[in-house]
């Protein structure tokens, strides 16, 4: 048994361009708290009881109202550690999610509003009774601060806590083949209490309680000699009385799993799935309400509003799980074809298309037109095994997207003067010139070579060239 | 009109970072992928990799893997390229480009190339 | 990694001639999607380098119907068919097939 300890340093804007808003506002006051759950071994695969090691969750945190105009400084965090305590060894290894939520304090109808701000996962090695390690995530553009530990509750001791420790009944040394405990040396190692009735002779036990057999014996108490002849049924008699091998106790004989939860075998040990409101590698941790904001990732929490009734998250759309633990790789059903790249941006997803392909899904081949390939209005044309875009007004370059320069071309004629304007272009004629290019010359008698300009237009007035 | 436009010319010790820059106008960043391409004097052109705005994405070369960091500033609409642990070998004019808003994958807009030169 | 070698990796001609220049890949650059990844780009000393086409034979726009590319599985062609002054540069061809590579170029120059 043992508690891991963490404690947030800070949380903050991390480094380089795109530091973050802040958080809170004058309009919107806020503080944060903190979510960390903890699971066995190195596997970033959420289990339905998501936090098999366990979970907790910080104080809030001081009230925080950002000052106008200025940048998400390091934010104010609650006070004190964050314990998880666990009752069995500890693994050794462990994955770990730590979530910072903003709790706002506006005057929200039916109290303060949760909301996820980042969230930061790893997998790490850490031996119990070992130093702090000081560690930094990065989630987006914020940066969190923190550092953890592992460590034993009397008497436990020892890289996984499974060493039992008592007090030394003899100042100078230990009794027979029982070490010293380190870091305790004024301790010495207890040993290991086994199953009640357990054989001293022919069983053995590496945690407390158990009752493991040596070759050639077998039992709940290891007191059987394993006979292999005269047995009834391929799996042994049902009687341990005849001599026959008997399998020992399963792992989910007895059902470990409390509250109701259901047991499966794993290849070394069991796994419970607990039902909600419980979790924990034995799904004994209970008493979860909707006030300690079990669903993660934005979750709606509905029901809980006392310990013994049990709570439901309403997941977001790509997350999933009993408290929306799990995300939901809506990439990898693969939805983006002919090579296209795949984006879930959590409200949406987007499809980025290789060269010769357009559409949601990357579905048109470009090579038919069948894709919408070109911006701000403008047509897809085929020609040439190619598509092309025919621009609208105002618009240019390969796929319309620049904005065209009408007055590029020098479209107005005998130095005409050439003003783009929304429509298209406008020529100012120089003395002389007329018409909406300025390709008129006005004959010297005054007459034009048109047949005569609109009433209040005088010639050389500027010309619009639709 | 598209334009990359990249930081000046830098001169940089043995060991030491660099960070260029790539300021994007006529576009959204968000919208493309920004690629990162070096050429040494007298040699191919190399790519580096990419980042994909829109959500941070990235994917770089083996060859540059552990040394070099490519981020975006998507409310500067600017894209960055960092290459620590210099050596003679990094001296080159970097290059960054972009595709086309329905496509990723093609070379079609170039910054002017910034200069970087290694020398202790 | 794919590698791409382009040949010759110098070439003098003069205004009006044929010009083809060849890129040879490691590994076939058809995708599975039926598609073929292989752009060709000039350069210009002090300059970047720009896109002329792109699928083996696709013209970007803006790029003079005298260059034109063919080729399929591991071979590709660049063919200028008739030299004009703004032609002497530098080509590379660039795989974007599997992740991105460059040949290393062909110098085009007068002779």
């Known amino acids: 048994a043992g508690v891991f300890e963490l404690q947030i340093h800070s949380f903050g804007p991390g480094p380089g361009p795109g530091a973050p808003r802040s958080p809170c506002s004058a309009r919107l006051p806020c503080r944060l708290f903190f979510r960390v759950c903890l699971k066995p071994g190195l596997s970033e695969e959420a289990a339905e009881s998501p936090c098999a090691l366990g979970a907790a969750l910080s104080a809030r945190g001081p009230v925080y109202t950002e000052q106008p105009g200025a940048p998400a400084p390091d934010l104010p965090l609650p006070d004190g550690l964050l314990q998880v305590p666990f009752r069995d060894a500890w693994p050794g290894t462990f994955s770990f999610i730590i979530e910072t939520w903003r709790e706002e304090l506006g005057d929200q109808i039916g109290g303060p509003a949760w909301s996820l701000l980042a969230r930061v996962a790893g997998r790490r090695r850490l031996a119990a009774g070992g130093p702090w390690a000081r560690d930094i995530q990065r989630a987006g553009a914020w940066e969190l601060r923190f550092s953890y530990r592992a460590r034993c509750e009397p008497p436990a001791v020892g890289t996984a806590c499974t060493r039992l420790c008592r007090p030394r009944s003899a100042p100078s040394r230990c009794g027979p083949g029982l070490r010293p405990c380190a870091p305790l040396e004024d301790e010495c190692e207890a040993p290991l209490v086994c199953r009640a009735g357990c054989s001293p002779e022919h069983g053995f036990c590496e945690q407390p309680g158990e009752c493991r057999c040596l070759e050639g014996w077998t039992g709940p108490l290891c007191t059987v000699p394993v006979s292999t002849s005269s047995c009834l049924s391929p799996r042994g008699p049902s009687s341990a009385t005849t001599g026959c091998l008997v399998p020992g106790p399963g792992p989910c004989d007895g059902n470990p799993c409390a509250n109701g939860g259901s047991c499966s075998e794993t290849p070394r040990s069991f796994e419970c799935t607990c039902p909600r409101g419980f979790y924990g590698l034995r799904c004994e941790v209970s008493g979860v309400t909707c006030a300690d904001g079990p669903c993660f990732n934005g979750g709606l929490c509905v029901g809980g509003a006392d310990p013994d009734s049990a709570y439901i998250c309403h997941c977001p759309p790509g997350f999933q799980g009993s408290n929306c633990e799990k995300r939901v790789d809506r990439c990898s059903l693969q939805p983006c074809r002919n090579g296209g790249l795949c984006l879930d941006l959590g409200h949406a997803l987007r499809c980025r298309c290789r060269a010769g392909f357009a559409g949601p899904r990357c579905e048109h081949d470009l090579d038919d037109c069948a894709g919408r390939a070109c911006a701000n209005g403008g047509t897809c044309v085929e020609g040439g095994g190619a598509h092309r875009c025919s621009c609208a007004l105002g618009f240019g370059g390969r796929d319309c997207r620049e904005r065209a320069d009408p007055c590029a071309a020098r479209p107005c004629a005998h130095g005409g003067r050439c003003y783009a304007h929304f429509s298209g272009l406008v020529c100012a004629c120089a003395p002389g010139y007329m018409g909406a290019r300025c390709e008129f010359p006005v004959h010297p008698d005054g007459a034009s070579a048109l047949p005569a300009a609109p009433p209040g237009l005088r010639p050389g007035d500027p010309q619009r060239y639709l | 009109q598209v334009q990359l436009v990249q930081s000046g010319a830098e001169v940089k010790k043995p060991g030491a970072s660099v960070k260029v820059s790539c300021k994007a106008s006529?576009?959204?960043?968000?919208?493309?992928?920004i690629h990162w391409v070096r050429q040494a004097p007298g040699q191919c052109l190399e790519w580096m990799g990419w980042?994909?705005?829109?959500?941070?994405?990235?994917e770089y070369a083996s060859k540059f893997q552990g040394r070099v960091t490519i981020t975006a500033d998507t409310s500067a609409n600017t894209a960055y390229m960092e290459l620590s642990s210099l050596r003679s070998e990094d001296t080159a004019v970097y290059y960054c480009?972009?595709?086309?808003?329905?496509?990723?994958?093609?070379?079609?807009?170039w910054g002017q190339g910034t200069l970087v030169t290694v020398s202790s | 990694d794919v590698q791409m070698t382009q040949s010759p990796s110098s070439l003098s001609a003069s205004v009006g001639d044929r010009v083809t220049i060849t890129c040879k890949s490691s590994?076939?650059?058809?995708?599975?999607?039926?598609?073929?990844?292989l752009n060709w780009l000039q350069q210009k000393p002090g300059q970047a380098p720009k896109l002329l086409l792109y699928?083996?034979?696709k013209l970007e726009s803006g790029v003079p119907s005298r260059f034109s590319g063919s080729g399929s599985g591991t071979d590709y062609t660049l063919t200028i068919s008739s030299l004009q002054p703004e032609d002497f540069a530098t080509y590379y061809c660039?795989?974007?097939?599997?992740?991105?590579?460059f040949g290393c170029g062909t110098k085009l120059e007068i002779k």
């Open positions: 480009a972009t595709s086309t808003y329905w496509s990723y994958d093609l070379f079609v807009y």
């Open positions: 006529g576009f959204n960043i968000k919208d493309d992928y």
């Open positions: 980042i994909d705005s829109e959500n941070g994405d990235t």
């Open positions: 590994q076939s650059l058809l995708h599975s999607n039926g598609k073929t990844y």
């Open positions: 699928l083996v034979s």
């Open positions: 660039l795989q974007t097939t599997h992740l991105y590579t």
